[in-house]
């Protein structure tokens, strides 16, 4: 089907970059500028994404791709493909509506985004607190009491390059 | 693309243990907090817990505490959901869901959920 | 702890619109998301953030929150749209979910 198809429709040779051309006799002409079509056969090119504002450009708009945005410093990305900027917060804070607010005694935020999560409960996971928490950290959980015998030593292990809620940009 | 995929169904003796597995694919698994969600017949949503799959920190539902264990293994990019001392009023669909990044914390990817039965 | 009031059921004429509400106590000062739940299915994320759409869910769903109400609107319903919707909050250490709506399209 889709060789007949191809056969019957001349815009399926318009390749990416052009737009199947109604006035001119179904001929493939270059998208116009700030527009673009990332798929071969279509009628129309899209607009550019522009990046204004609080956005700013990532990647310039080509005839074949949109634009990308991220955000100015001070912000993060929320949704897909960046569709909207975010205020950061400081770690050991969270985002409200009314702006920035201090996560309250037995909560942590170890990032710039995000909500103020309680500190997890060791012993429900039948652990011990080996570090505890503060505004800006999880407590870490340690073996339980009773594995800790004599001599042994418990290590802190090194911070992770990335929490949950950073999503690669 | 984005997936989670659970174990099997389940059917349990009441009293028993039940662990359900959610793999996740096409992230970064550790970059995201993963919840637990049940759903009994008929009703509504549930939520269980959260695991943060990079240090193991976790956060359960009052309601589950002391019966709910949420655990992690990163080199399978897997979290497990175990329930214990079961009942028939633990029958229920239980669903991993991956945490997005809205203000306000939002389940932004579901798994296809796990039917556990308690029956004797 | 923190509680979220839906109304049982809602029904609607196709092409019409449909409002879901969601009731908590100040809620308009939360972040309320919104799922969809078909029979046999996982719930879809269809609104977060109160009234911000994620890609792939049509332009007919929005959503809106202030005071004691926060509402998902859904503008002319298609059969498609027949579904469980529940409304979702963060509160200080749990997530919790309203009861759900069934919303039937006549």
């Known amino acids: 089907f889709e060789r007949t198809r191809s056969l019957q429709d001349p815009c399926s040779n318009c390749p990416a970059g052009t737009f199947c051309d109604n006035n001119r006799n179904q001929i493939c002409s270059p998208c116009p500028p700030n527009s673009f079509s990332s798929a071969g056969g279509q009628r129309t090119c899209d607009i550019c994404r522009q990046c204004k504002g609080v956005f700013r450009t990532r990647k310039e708009c080509s005839s074949t791709s949109n634009a990308e945005c991220d955000c100015t410093p001070g912000f993060h990305c929320l949704g897909a493909g960046c569709s909207m900027c975010e205020q950061d917060c400081k770690q050991g804070q969270e985002l409200t509506k009314k702006g920035c607010k201090d996560c309250c005694f037995g909560t942590f935020n170890d990032q710039k985004r995000g909500i103020c999560r309680p500190w997890t409960n060791c012993s429900l996971d039948g652990k011990s607190v080996l570090v505890n928490g503060t505004k800006e950290r999880d407590v870490v959980c340690g073996p339980s009491p009773a594995d800790l015998s004599p001599g042994a030593s418990s290590v802190t292990p090194p911070a992770p390059a990335r929490e949950p809620g950073h999503s690669p940009q | 693309q984005m997936q989670l995929v659970q174990s099997g169904a389940e059917v349990k003796k009441p009293g028993a243990s039940v662990k359900v597995s959610c793999k996740a694919s096409?992230?970064?698994?550790?970059?995201?907090?993963m919840h637990w969600v049940r759903q009994a017949p008929g009703q509504g949503l549930e939520w269980m817990g959260w695991i943060n799959p990079n240090s193991g920190g976790t956060n359960y539902a009052q309601k589950f505490q002391g019966r709910v264990t949420i655990t992690r293994d990163t080199s399978a990019s897997t979290a497990y959901m175990e329930l214990s001392s079961l009942r028939s009023e633990d029958t229920a669909v239980y669903y991993c869901?991956?945490?997005?990044?809205?203000?306000?914390?939002?389940?932004?990817?579901w798994g296809q959920g796990t039917l556990v039965t308690v029956s004797s | 702890s923190y509680e979220l009031t839906q109304p049982p059921s809602v029904s609607v004429a196709p092409g019409k619109t449909a409002r879901i509400t969601c009731g908590g106590n100040?809620?308009?000062?939360?972040?309320v998301h919104w799922y969809q739940q078909k029979p046999g299915q996982a719930p879809v994320l269809v609104i977060y953030?109160?009234?911000d759409r994620p890609s792939g869910i049509p332009e007919r769903f929005s959503g809106s929150n202030s005071g004691n109400t926060a509402t998902l609107t859904i503008s002319r319903v298609e059969a498609g749209d027949e579904a469980d919707y529940y409304c979702?909050?963060?509160?200080?250490?749990?997530?919790?979910f309203g009861g759900g709506t069934q919303l039937t399209v006549l």
């Open positions: 869901a991956r945490e997005g990044e809205a203000v306000g914390l939002d389940l932004d990817y």
């Open positions: 096409g992230y970064t698994f550790t970059g995201y907090y």
């Open positions: 100040n809620i308009g000062s939360k972040s």
């Open positions: 953030y109160d009234s």
């Open positions: 979702q909050v963060w509160d200080s250490s749990s997530v919790v």
